[in-house]
């Protein structure tokens, strides 16, 4: 899977969209999880309604919401009041049984609020010199990782 980058401004809301084949994933609940390290597990943040027919209802976990347009085939995740610690790699998932298929890998980048004069040194997003495989560019409110980028800050 390619990784798509979504950029948001600290303190504001960020909406992430994950398109999918609505017939292929018919009847399946969806989830949004956070990747713990490059090879680590994906920790569930929020999932759609337990009843698939009610997947259009927005479900919240803290400041993260999820809603699923099951006919149109678009999963939408909203990160409200975006904070620096929200930056990182996530996945949109389609659930079947206890397993999950990855619909999209998402890198969330948190940009400093231009009206906020506090130190932005703790805001992280990948530098262009870093490496990441299987990336392509997509221009919109989101983009896919460029060749040479990685989704995690280098470990010391």
């Amino acid at each position: 899977h390619n990784t798509t980058v979504f950029q948001g401004v600290a303190g504001q809301s960020l909406q992430v969209s994950c398109p999918y084949d609505s017939m292929k994933h018919w009847g399946r609940r969806k989830a949004w999880c956070r990747q713990l390290g490059e090879k680590g597990p994906c920790q569930r943040v929020v999932s759609t309604h337990n009843l698939w027919l009610l997947s259009f209802l927005r479900r919240w976990n803290g400041s993260t919401a999820i809603t699923d347009d099951t006919l149109g085939g678009t999963l939408t995740i909203t990160l409200r009041n975006l904070q620096p610690h929200d930056a990182g790699l996530y996945q949109c998932q389609s659930l079947h049984g206890s397993e999950a298929d990855t619909l999209r890998k998402v890198l969330v980048e948190v940009l400093a609020d231009p009206l906020d004069h506090r130190d932005a040194g703790d805001l992280w997003f990948p530098g262009e010199s870093e490496s990441f495989e299987d990336a392509h560019v997509e221009h919109s409110i989101s983009r896919s990782l460029l060749e040479g980028e990685i989704p995690f800050p280098p470990t010391s």
Partner: antibody
Framework: EVQLVQSGAEVKKPGESLKISCKGS????????IAWVRQMPGKGLEWMGI????????RYAPSFQGQVTISADKSISTAYLQWSSLKASDTAMYFC????????????????WGQGTLVTVSS | DIQMTQSPSSVSASVGDRVTITCRAS??????LAWYQQKPGKAPKLLIY???SLQRGVPSRFSGSGSGTDFTLTISSLQPEDFATYFC?????????FGQGTKLEIK
């Protein structure tokens, strides 16, 4: 009426290749996963793998990975199971099955089965 | 892989009897379990899915229960056409796996 019609019985020699088919009708073939299940003589059922004909996304059971190839031609609503080099141990009945997801369960079950294709491999 | 173990492997019963077949998973599978009936020379037929949901067209004398690791299929009053082999199957994870089967014979 939903139907999965499989190709006829085959008798082959070890080392030969084979491709058996499963034609779906009475439903949208590209909208449901199709799995293959093996039943050796007098034995139980073994799940071999599954394919989504809409985009040919395929998963295999580890024990069948590299031993068989599952494919589909959505233009003729047909799924295939093939071997490049048969062994005597491949002698079995092979079923193609439609896998249906039940929306309040979010998992899939085999709701329609083909009649089976008996493959006999003997020298 | 998840192992599915059925018991008994065979059972003899008479028409009108109540019969229970059990299926145990080697790890928890929530309610992701199906039961199939197979008659000699025929393809299996889906009876129960999601552990307890009756497939359309299946007689109400068939019922399923259980969750986690232990499941049962019950036939409340055996009919002549029910003598067959029954398989459980987990739908929790790939690869999907089946129980070894329970043969229901006429006493």
């Amino acid at each position: 009426e939903v139907q999965l019609v499989q190709s006829g019985a085959e008798v082959k020699k070890p080392g030969e290749s084979l491709k058996i088919s499963c034609k779906g009708s009475g439903y949208s073939f590209t909208s449901y996963w199709i799995a293959w299940v093996r039943q050796m003589p007098g034995k139980g059922l073994e799940w071999m793998g599954i394919i989504y004909p809409g985009d040919s996304d395929t998963r295999y059971a580890p024990s069948f990975q590299g031993q068989v190839t599952i494919s589909a031609d959505k233009s003729i609503s047909t799924a295939y199971l093939q071997w490049s080099s048969l062994k005597a141990s491949d002698t079995a009945m092979y079923f193609c099955v439609r896998s249906r997801t039940f929306y309040y369960d979010s998992s899939d079950y085999f709701d329609y089965w083909g009649q089976g294709t008996l493959v006999t491999v003997s020298s | 892989d998840i192992q599915m173990t059925q018991s008994p492997s065979s059972v003899s019963a008479s028409v009108g009897d109540r019969v229970t077949i059990t299926c145990r998973a080697s790890q928890g599978i929530s309610s992701w379990l199906a039961w199939y009936q197979q008659k000699p020379g025929k393809a299996p037929k889906l009876l129960i899915y999601a552990a307890s949901s009756l497939q359309r067209g299946v007689p109400s004398r068939f019922s399923g229960s259980g969750s986690g690791t232990d499941f049962t299929l019950t036939i409340s009053s055996l009919q002549p056409e029910d003598f067959a082999t029954y398989f459980c199957q987990q739908a929790d994870s790939f690869p999907r796996t089946f129980g070894q089967g329970t043969k229901l014979e006429i006493k």
